[in-house]
Interface confidence: medium
C-alpha cells in the first residue's frame, strides 16, 4: 500500500530524475541520427546549412566544466522548443516534398514535445524557477523553394544533433555532481 | 577512405608528458566525436575520454581527470591527447577512434601509438 | 561505474561451427528503446573493429554471420558460422552511463 494519508510523498531522487531525463534525450539524438542519414542519403546537400532563425549553440568550448543545472535546463528547453517549432514548420511547408520522410519527422517531432514535458517535470520536481510562457514567436516565412526547404531541413537536424549531444554531456555531468 | 592516423610510438621518463595526434580523413570531421581509449598489456580496454570538434568541450573519465587534455585543431582535422604526469602504468597503445555524438561507441579506430614509460 | 563480464574467457572451435560469447553487465545498459552495448572484434597488433552496435544493429561492412541480440543486462555475439579470418578477441563496451567500460574480452581460438 501507498504512504498513509497526510503524509508527504517521498521527493524523487534528483539523480535517477536525471538519469531518466539523460536517456530520454539520447534516445532524440539517435532518432536524429537517424533521420539525418536518411535526409542526406534522399536529399544530398553539401557543405554547411543555416538557418537565421535557429538558436545558437549554447556550449562554447571549455564551458561544460562550469554548467550549472537551473541554466542548463532553461537554456535546453528554450532551444529544445524552438527546435519543436522548426520541425512543425517543416512537416507543414514541406509535406509533399519531405514526404518519404513524414513518418520519421511525425516521431521527431512526437518525442521532441515528450522531452519538453519531461524537462518542464523535472525543473519543478527540482524546485527550480518556472518560466513564464514564452511569448509568442513570429511565423516562420515558408521556404522560398523546395530547395531551400531541404537546406532548412539539413540545417534544422544538424543543429538539433549538436544541441542534443551538448544537451546529454551537460547532463551526464551534472549527474555526477549531484 | 575514412581514415584516423596516429602519431608514432614514443618513449618517455616518469613525470614527462606526452602529446598524441590523430589526423582524420575522409569524413566531415565535425560531425562526429574524438575518443581516445587506453589499452595497457594485459589489461582490458580504458576510456579515457571525448571531444566534440565543433564545441571543442572535453569529457573524461574522472579516472583520467587532470592528467588528460584533449584538444582539436578543426582547420587540420587533427585531434590530440596529452598525457602529463606519466607513470609506468600508463605504458599502453593509446587509440584514437571516432564516436557517434553522445552514444560513445567507436567505428573507426586509428592504427594505436605505444607510448613506453621507463626511467 | 557499470562493471561488464565476458564468458568464456576462451573458446576453442573450429570453423563452420556457430560460436556464442556472452556478456552480463553489473546493471541494466537498456532503457527508452535502446540497449546501450556494443560488440569488438580485434587481431593481435591490430586496433579494435566495431561489429555490432546498440546491441543488434550490424555495422556497416561486417559479415552477416555476425549477430548481436540481448536487452537489460544479459547480452550476446553470435558467429553463425566461423571462418578462419573469424578467430580473434571480441569486446563489448556499454555506453549507458559515463564512463564507457569494456569487458574483459573473449578470446575465440581454432580448434
Known amino acids: 500500500p501507498g504512504p498513509p494519508p497526510g503524509s508527504p510523498r517521498a521527493s524523487p531522487d534528483p539523480r535517477a530524475e536525471l538519469d531518466s531525463t539523460v536517456l530520454l534525450t539520447r534516445s532524440l539524438l539517435e532518432d536524429t541520427r537517424q533521420l539525418t542519414i536518411q535526409l542526406k542519403d534522399k536529399f544530398p546537400a553539401d557543405g554547411d546549412h543555416n538557418l537565421d532563425s535557429l538558436p545558437t549553440l549554447a556550449m562554447s568550448a571549455g564551458a561544460l566544466g562550469a554548467l550549472q543545472l537551473p541554466s542548463v535546463l532553461t537554456r535546453l528547453r528554450a532551444d529544445l522548443l524552438s527546435y519543436l517549432r522548426h520541425v512543425q514548420w517543416l512537416r507543414r511547408a514541406m509535406g509533399s516534398s519531405l514526404k518519404t520522410l513524414e513518418p520519421e519527422l511525425g516521431t521527431l517531432q512526437t518525442r521532441l514535445d515528450r522531452l519538453l514535458r519531461r524537462l518542464q517535470l523535472l525543473m519543478s520536481r527540482l524546485a527550480l524557477p518556472q518560466l513564464p510562457p514564452d511569448p509568442p514567436a513570429p511565423p516562420l516565412a515558408p521556404p522560398s523553394s523546395t530547395w531551400g526547404g531541404i537546406r532548412a531541413a539539413h540545417a534544422i537536424l544538424g543543429g538539433l544533433h549538436l544541441t542534443l549531444d551538448w544537451a546529454v554531456r551537460g547532463l551526464l555531468l551534472l549527474k555526477t555532481r549531484l | 577512405e575514412v581514415q584516423l592516423v596516429q602519431s608514432g610510438a614514443e618513449v618517455k621518463k616518469p613525470g614527462a608528458s606526452v602529446k598524441i595526434s590523430c589526423k582524420a580523413s575522409?569524413?566531415?570531421?565535425?560531425?562526429?566525436?574524438m575518443d581516445w581509449v587506453k589499452q595497457a598489456p594485459g589489461q582490458r580496454l580504458e576510456w579515457i575520454g571525448d571531444i566534440n570538434p565543433t564545441i571543442g568541450a572535453p569529457i573524461y573519465n574522472q579516472k583520467f581527470t587532470g592528467r588528460a587534455t584533449l584538444t582539436v585543431d578543426k582547420s587540420a582535422s587533427t585531434a590530440y591527447m596529452e598525457l602529463s604526469s606519466l607513470r609506468s602504468e600508463d605504458t599502453a597503445v593509446y587509440y584514437c577512434a571516432r564516436g557517434e555524438l553522445a552514444h560513445w561507441y567507436f567505428d573507426v579506430w586509428g592504427q594505436g601509438t605505444t607510448v613506453t614509460v621507463s626511467s | 561505474d557499470i562493471v561488464l563480464t565476458q564468458s568464456p574467457a576462451s573458446l576453442a572451435l573450429s570453423p563452420g561451427e556457430r560460436a556464442t560469447l556472452s556478456c552480463r553487465a553489473s546493471?541494466?545498459?537498456?532503457?527508452?528503446?535502446?540497449?546501450?552495448i556494443h560488440w569488438y572484434q580485434q587481431k593481435p597488433g591490430q586496433a579494435p573493429r566495431l561489429l555490432i552496435y546498440?546491441?543488434?544493429n550490424l555495422e556497416s561492412g561486417v559479415p552477416a554471420r555476425f549477430s548481436g541480440s540481448g536487452s537489460g543486462t544479459d547480452f550476446t555475439l553470435t558467429i553463425s558460422s566461423l571462418e578462419e579470418e573469424d578467430f580473434a578477441t571480441y569486446y563489448c563496451?556499454?555506453?549507458?552511463?559515463?564512463?564507457?567500460?569494456f569487458g574483459q574480452g573473449t578470446k575465440l581460438e581454432i580448434k
Open positions: 575522409g569524413y566531415i570531421f565535425r560531425d562526429y566525436n
Open positions: 546498440l546491441a543488434s
Open positions: 563496451q556499454h555506453s549507458r552511463d559515463l564512463p564507457p567500460t
Open positions: 546493471k541494466s545498459v537498456s532503457t527508452e528503446g535502446y540497449s546501450y
